[in-house]
Interface confidence: low
C-alpha cells in the first residue's frame, strides 16, 4: 500500500524520514519524481536498480539474496579500489614471475618444430589421397601462445569444388588407417567441425578442421602482434595459464576459448592510458566513421606489421546513410556553394583499401609486472564485461546494443568475422559470476605482496572451483 503522505502527522513524517535515512545506508533512495513506468513506486534501490513501492517493500528487498550479494560485491569492489599502489620491488618481482612463467609454460622453438613436423607428416599422409588439399598450422602453436600441453590446430585448405563435410569424413578415414595416429575421432557437432587425433610420436592432440579461414586470419594477427610487441606474448601466456588454473578456458564446459584471452590482452593494451597498441581502424583512415565501422573489413596481415583493410561501400549502412543524406538535401534550400557535413562525410570515404600499423611509434617503457597487474585490474574494476563488447578494431567502447548482443555474459568480437561473439560458449550466469570472482581473487592476490611459501590457495583454485564451474544448477537472479 502507498501511504498518502499529506495525511501524515509531523511525528509520522519524522519517523518516515528516519526510516528513509536508514534505507539510504542500504542504497535505497526516495525518488524525487516518480517514474512514469512505476507510478506506485516511491523508492529506488540504486544498487540493484529496482523500483520499490514503500518502506515495507524496501525492508523486504534488503533481505533478498541479490541485494545482499550486491552489497558484498560493492564492499569488495571498494576494498579492491583502495588497495595500496605496488612498490617498485613488488612490480619487479611480478615482472620476473611473468617472464619465468612464460618460459616454463610456453612452447620453445623446439616444441614449435615438433608441431610443424606433425603438420608436415600429416600433409604427406593426407595429400597422398587428396593431392589438391594443403595443410597449415594455426592457433596457439603458431602464435607461440601455446602452453606445452596445448592442442595442435591444423586446417585443411581445399578447392571450392570439394564438399566440406565429405572432405572431413575422408580425412577421418585416412587418419584412422594411418599408423602415425591414435584415438582418431570426429567431432562434427562442434562449432567448428573437426577430426581429433593423437600424434603417436609426440602424444600431442591434433584438431584438424577444414576451410577455417577466419581462425587462420586471427592467428596471423596475434602472431604478428607477438613479434612486434615484446610484452604481448608473456602477458598472453600468463593470462592463459591463469585461465587454465582456474579452469575457465574449457569451451566445452561453458568456459572461454583460449584465444579469447589473447584478444582480451590486445584490447587491454589498446584501452590502457596511454595505450601500448593501436586500434586496427581509426581516424587516420580518410572518411572513417566509427558508426560505419562495419563497412571496413579487415583482410589479413601484410609485411608482418600491418593489418590490411577494405572499404565496402555496398553495405546496408551506406545505403541508409545515402538515403538519409538525400532526404536532408531535399529539405535544404538549393545553394550549390554550400556543402553539408553529411556530404563531406560520404565523399570522404575515398580510400577503398589500405593498411593499419600494428604498433605505435613510441616504444613501450612499462614494466611487464605492472602490465600484468593493470590487466587484472582492468577486467576486475575498470571494464564492465557485462555491458560492453571487447572489440579490438576501434578505440570507442561498443555497447551490447551496438552489436545487438544482449544476453551474453562476456562479448568478444572476432575482428575478422564481426558478427561472431567468440566468447559465446560462456552462456551461464553461474560461470560468468565464477569468472568475475576469479578476476577479483587474482587481482587481490597479485596486488598484495606475497610472502615466500605463503597462501597458495588463490592461485590454485582447481579443487574448490572445478566443481563450481561444471555445476549445472540454475542461477536465480535474486
Amino acid at each position: 500500500t502507498v501511504i498518502d503522505e499529506s495525511a501524515l502527522t509531523p511525528e509520522q513524517r519524522l519517523g518516515l524520514k528516519q526510516a528513509e535515512e536508514r534505507l539510504e545506508r542500504d542504497h535505497i533512495f526516495r525518488l524525487e519524481k516518480r517514474s512514469p513506468e512505476y507510478t506506485n513506486c516511491r523508492y529506488l534501490c540504486k544498487l540493484c536498480l529496482i523500483h520499490i513501492e514503500n518502506i515495507q517493500g524496501a525492508h523486504k528487498h534488503i533481505k533478498e539474496k541479490r541485494h545482499k550479494k550486491n552489497i558484498l560485491e560493492k564492499q569488495e569492489e571498494s576494498e579492491l579500489r583502495s588497495l595500496p599502489s605496488p612498490s617498485s620491488a613488488h612490480l619487479a618481482a611480478l615482472s620476473v614471475a611473468v617472464v619465468e612463467l612464460a618460459k616454463e609454460q610456453g612452447i620453445t622453438d623446439d616444441d614449435l618444430r615438433i608441431r610443424q613436423d606433425i603438420v608436415e607428416e600429416m600433409s604427406k599422409v593426407i595429400m597422398t589421397f587428396l593431392p589438391e588439399c594443403s595443410l597449415r598450422l594455426y592457433g596457439s602453436s603458431l602464435t607461440k601462445f601455446a602452453l606445452k600441453s596445448s592442442d595442435v590446430n591444423i586446417d585443411i585448405k581445399f578447392p571450392p569444388k570439394m564438399n566440406h563435410p565429405d572432405l572431413l569424413i575422408q580425412v577421418l578415414g585416412i587418419l584412422k588407417k594411418s599408423a602415425l595416429y591414435i584415438d582418431v575421432e570426429s567431432d562434427f557437432h562442434a562449432k567448428v567441425p573437426v577430426v581429433v587425433c593423437k600424434d603417436r610420436k609426440s602424444a600431442l592432440l591434433c584438431r584438424v578442421s577444414a576451410g577455417n579461414d577466419m581462425a587462420c586470419l586471427t592467428t596471423d594477427l596475434l602472431a604478428a602482434l607477438g613479434k612486434v610487441e615484446p610484452v604481448f606474448t608473456p602477458l598472453v601466456l600468463a593470462f592463459r595459464y591463469w585461465a587454465k588454473l582456474c579452469y575457465i578456458d574449457s569451451q566445452t564446459d561453458g568456459g572461454i576459448p583460449s584465444y579469447c584471452f589473447a584478444l582480451m590482452v590486445m584490447f587491454f593494451l589498446q584501452q590502457r592510458k596511454p595505450p601500448l597498441l593501436p586500434c586496427l581502424l581509426g581516424s587516420w583512415i580518410e572518411g572513417f566513421d566509427p558508426k560505419r565501422m562495419d563497412d571496413f573489413q579487415l583482410k589479413g596481415i601484410v609485411e608482418e606489421k600491418f593489418v590490411k583493410w577494405e572499404y565496402n561501400s555496398s553495405s546496408a549502412t551506406e545505403k541508409n546513410l545515402i538515403a538519409d543524406e538525400n532526404k536532408a538535401k531535399a529539405d535544404e534550400p538549393k545553394d550549390d556553394t554550400k556543402k553539408t557535413e553529411t556530404d563531406n562525410q560520404s565523399n570522404a570515404a575515398k580510400a577503398k583499401h589500405g593498411k593499419s600499423p600494428l604498433t605505435l611509434e613510441a616504444p613501450n617503457q612499462v614494466p611487464l609486472g605492472q602490465l600484468w597487474l593493470e590487466l587484472l585490474k582492468f577486467y576486475t574494476l575498470d571494464f564492465a564485461l557485462e555491458e560492453y563488447v571487447i572489440c579490438v578494431r576501434i578505440q570507442d567502447i561498443l555497447t551490447r546494443e551496438n552489436k545487438n548482443w544482449p544476453k551474453r555474459r562476456i562479448a568478444i568480437e572476432d575482428p575478422f568475422s564481426v558478427k561472431r561473439n567468440v566468447a559465446r560458449s560462456l552462456n551461464s550466469q553461474l560461470v560468468y559470476e565464477y569468472v568475475v570472482e576469479r578476476f577479483r581473487a587474482a587481482y587481490r592476490y597479485f596486488a598484495c605482496p606475497q610472502k615466500k611459501g605463503g597462501n597458495k590457495s588463490t592461485m590454485d583454485p582447481k579443487k574448490k572451483e572445478k566443481g563450481k564451474l561444471s555445476s549445472k544448477k540454475p542461477v536465480k537472479s535474486d
Partner: nanobody
Framework: QVQLQESGGGLVQAGGSLRLSCAAS????????MGWYRQAPGKEREFVAG???????YYADSVKGRFTISRDNAKNTVYLQMNSLKPEDTAVYYC????????????WGQGTQVTVSS
C-alpha cells in the same frame, strides 16, 4: 546441453483437468522463458502458454481462462494446469525452454500425449 522431461499427460474426459510438469536439467540461462506448445494430429505445432523468469504469463486465446502456467525457478520446472478440457485440446504437448533473443538457444522436450474424450 539442456534436457527437458515432461510428465502428467494422459486420457481424461471432457470437462476434466490435468497438470503437466516439465523439469529442465543441464546448463541453462537463469533468465530463459519456459513454455508449452502442442501439436494435434495433422496440424502444425502451436503455442499454448509461456512464462518469463519473473513470472509474467502469456496464453493462446483458445486456452485463456482454462489453462494456467506457472514455474518454480529454484527447481527449473514449469507446470501447466489444464481445466475444463475439451476434445479439441487433444494433442502432444511439448515443453520448451528458450532465449527469445537467440533462436539457436531453444530446447524442446520429447512431448507428452493428452487425450480428451467426449
Amino acid at each position: 546441453q539442456v534436457q527437458l522431461q515432461e510428465s502428467g499427460g494422459g486420457l481424461v474426459q471432457a470437462g476434466g483437468s490435468l497438470r503437466l510438469s516439465c523439469a529442465a536439467s543441464g546448463t541453462i540461462f537463469y533468465d530463459v522463458i519456459m513454455g508449452w506448445y502442442r501439436q494435434a494430429p495433422g496440424k502444425e505445432r502451436e503455442f499454448v502458454a509461456g512464462i518469463t523468469y519473473g513470472g509474467t504469463t502469456y496464453y493462446a486465446d483458445s486456452v485463456k481462462g482454462r489453462f494456467t502456467i506457472s514455474r518454480d525457478n529454484a527447481k527449473n520446472t514449469v507446470y501447466l494446469q489444464m481445466n475444463s478440457l475439451k476434445p479439441e485440446d487433444t494433442a502432444v504437448y511439448y515443453c520448451a525452454v528458450g532465449d527469445p533473443t537467440d533462436p539457436s538457444y531453444y530446447y524442446w522436450g520429447q512431448g507428452t500425449q493428452v487425450t480428451v474424450s467426449s
